[in-house]
Interface confidence: low
């Protein structure tokens, strides 16, 4: 059973709320609040909880608040990907995914946010202060990772707050000229606002667009920041890393990755199905159970496959160009 | 067949930087992780970290974190690696190394870190007072 | 950091003799392995990646087998130009690790 909350997300007044007039003039204000807050340094937020059916099991949830296009996702725990910490999973929007054990599915929940589900390793009681990391790449911000744990006192069932960046950091230069640009918008946003402050103040309103939102037990910055840009968060159920360090992959390939062609995004097919075919369109992606392709560059599966669809929130887009075969 | 062509031999003092170069040619630059890879005088292989071009994401091994950095020209299809803080530990040869191409996933280019098919020469560095 | 504890350190053999060296992983690398060739003075080639596939090009006496944790690198005939030392290699996670390496030479 999971327990979530939604997310009040900032919404403009209905009209009928106030009069004509007084609708228009507030509707310059809510533009640049949504600029205003969404703009500036991206943030990328990361959610842990346990899950109450799977006592070896956590729920980690990680997503990215800023405008550009993300290239990359990298999740790690023990620790940042490349500082001490072990990846679990990589996702690339075009390219596919490829997952270490005891990841279970890594997959897209948005285009801004991933989810990831760790295999119970079967630990007598799961380690709370495991900490999970998520590193976006994206464009033009650069890179940013940020990191996150359960809450010592957490009970099964109960998710954590969402944690901004707890480490966020900038690995690359980012094109942040943005903000100045909305410097003055935001300045007047302010004029305006005080200009109206003896109406009543817009009420604060759960999104209608955003059904799997999540709960945070208080409102922040950074969950306006996500709310206005009607961001959702991913589901990342993960298991508590052994004491040994080595887990082996439920189903005996420890990782898997692939891709699947728009056409074929309609119904599932084996891989004898679409094993050949040529670069794919983006379209959606499909986890495959242990299909860890490599007779010089491409592996058959261990096993039979599991397939399972998730669609590409960006839709389909033709991949950049030729690229060379191992 | 790629290449890659290294800078020349440095010779530093400690507490400098040193900044190593690493051209490529024959091939395509971005098209797959570079990674830096140090060898100290009769030890066997470091891997400081690595760069993947095409996603323009990094990664540092935790012993250098913070000391070293690397960047990529694609105009020039070069990468750098640049150590701070050097010490007489950090006298060894420097390698640059990448994967030929990206492999290959139901026909689809996966690029990450795998095994290293194409070394530079190396670049010497000699760390002393 | 998973460790990668290779041995023997070194091992003399008679041209013809085959010649096996072994690498054990700190935890469950899939495939995810290589070994390298390295001759003094010189940049190690790669000779086996996927733990088991010949690089384009290598002699077919040289193999590889394994998965998980333990794997095998085989010279099935040693000949004089394969005096060196030898690495593993895993890139199944970060930071990526080295053996200590085989320094192979001839009795």
């Known amino acids: 059973m999971r327990t979530e909350a939604q997310v009040p997300a900032l919404q403009p007044p209905e009209p009928g709320l106030e009069g004509a007039m007084g609708h228009r003039t507030l509707v310059l204000p809510w533009v640049l609040l949504t600029l205003c807050v969404t703009a500036g340094t991206p943030e990328v937020w990361v959610q842990v909880r346990m899950e109450a059916t799977e006592l070896s099991s956590f729920t980690i949830r990680c997503g990215f608040l800023g405008s550009g296009s993300i290239s990359l996702v990298t999740v790690s725990w023990g620790g940042p990907n490349g500082a001490g910490g072990t990846t679990l999973a990589v996702l690339h929007p075009e390219r596919g995914i490829r997952q270490w054990a005891p990841a279970r599915q890594a997959r897209w929940e948005t285009q801004s946010s991933i989810s990831l589900i760790l295999e119970g390793s079967g630990a007598s009681s799961p380690c709370a202060n495991t900490t999970f990391c998520c590193k976006f790449a994206s464009f033009p911000e650069g890179s940013w990772e940020a990191c996150g744990s359960l809450p010592p006192s957490s009970d099964p069932g109960l998710s954590a707050p969402p944690t901004p960046a707890p480490i966020l950091r900038a690995d690359l230069a980012g094109i942040l000229g943005v903000s100045g640009v909305l410097l003055f918008g935001c300045v007047y946003l302010l004029h305006l606002l005080r200009r109206h402050k003896h109406r009543p103040a817009p009420r604060l309103q759960p999104s209608r667009t955003s059904p799997q939102a999540p709960r945070a037990r208080a409102w922040a910055p950074s969950q306006a920041s996500q709310a206005a840009l009607h961001v959702p968060y991913a589901t990342i159920n993960t298991s508590c890393r052994p004491a040994t360090l080595d887990t082996a992959h439920p189903h005996g390939g420890p990782s898997w990755w692939a891709s699947l062609p728009t056409h074929a995004a309609h119904r599932p097919q084996g891989p004898a199905a679409w094993a050949s075919t040529p670069i794919p369109a983006r379209g959606s992606f499909v986890s495959v159970e242990n299909g860890l392709y490599a007779q010089a560059g491409e592996r058959p599966p261990h096993t039979g496959p599991g397939l399972t669809l998730f669609p590409d929130p960006r839709g389909p887009r033709a991949m950049e160009g030729p690229l060379g075969v191992r | 067949q790629m290449q890659l062509v290294q800078s020349g031999a440095e010779v530093k003092k400690p507490g400098s930087s040193v900044k190593v170069s690493c051209k490529a040619s024959?091939?395509?630059?971005?098209?797959?992780?570079i990674s830096w890879v140090r060898q100290a005088p009769g030890q066997g292989f470091e891997w400081m970290g690595g760069?993947?071009?095409?996603?323009?994401?990094?990664d540092y091994a935790q012993k250098f974190q913070g000391r070293v950095t690397i960047t990529t020209d694609e105009s020039t299809s070069t990468a750098y690696m640049e150590l701070s803080s050097l010490t007489s530990e950090d006298t060894a040869v420097y390698y640059c190394a990448r994967d030929d191409t990206a492999r290959r996933v139901r026909g689809v280019p996966y690029y990450y870190y795998y095994a290293m098919d194409v070394w530079g020469q190396g670049t010497t560095v000699t760390v002393s007072s | 950091d998973i460790q990668m504890t290779q041995s023997p350190s070194s091992l003399s053999a008679s041209v013809g003799d085959r010649v096996t060296i072994t690498c054990q992983a700190s935890?469950?690398?899939?495939?995810?392995l290589s070994w390298y060739q390295q001759k003094p003075g010189k940049a190690p080639k790669l000779l086996i990646f996927d733990a088991s596939n010949l690089k384009t090009g290598v002699s077919s006496r040289f193999s590889g087998s394994g998965s998980g944790t333990d794997f095998t690198f085989t010279i099935s005939s040693l000949q004089p130009e394969d005096i060196a030392t030898y690495y593993c290699h895993q890139y199944d996670n970060l930071p990526l690790t080295f053996g200590g390496g085989t320094k192979v030479e001839i009795k």
């Open positions: 760069i993947i071009p095409i996603y323009g994401i990094t």
């Open positions: 935890r469950d690398i899939s495939d995810s």
């Open positions: 024959g091939g395509t630059f971005s098209s797959s992780a």
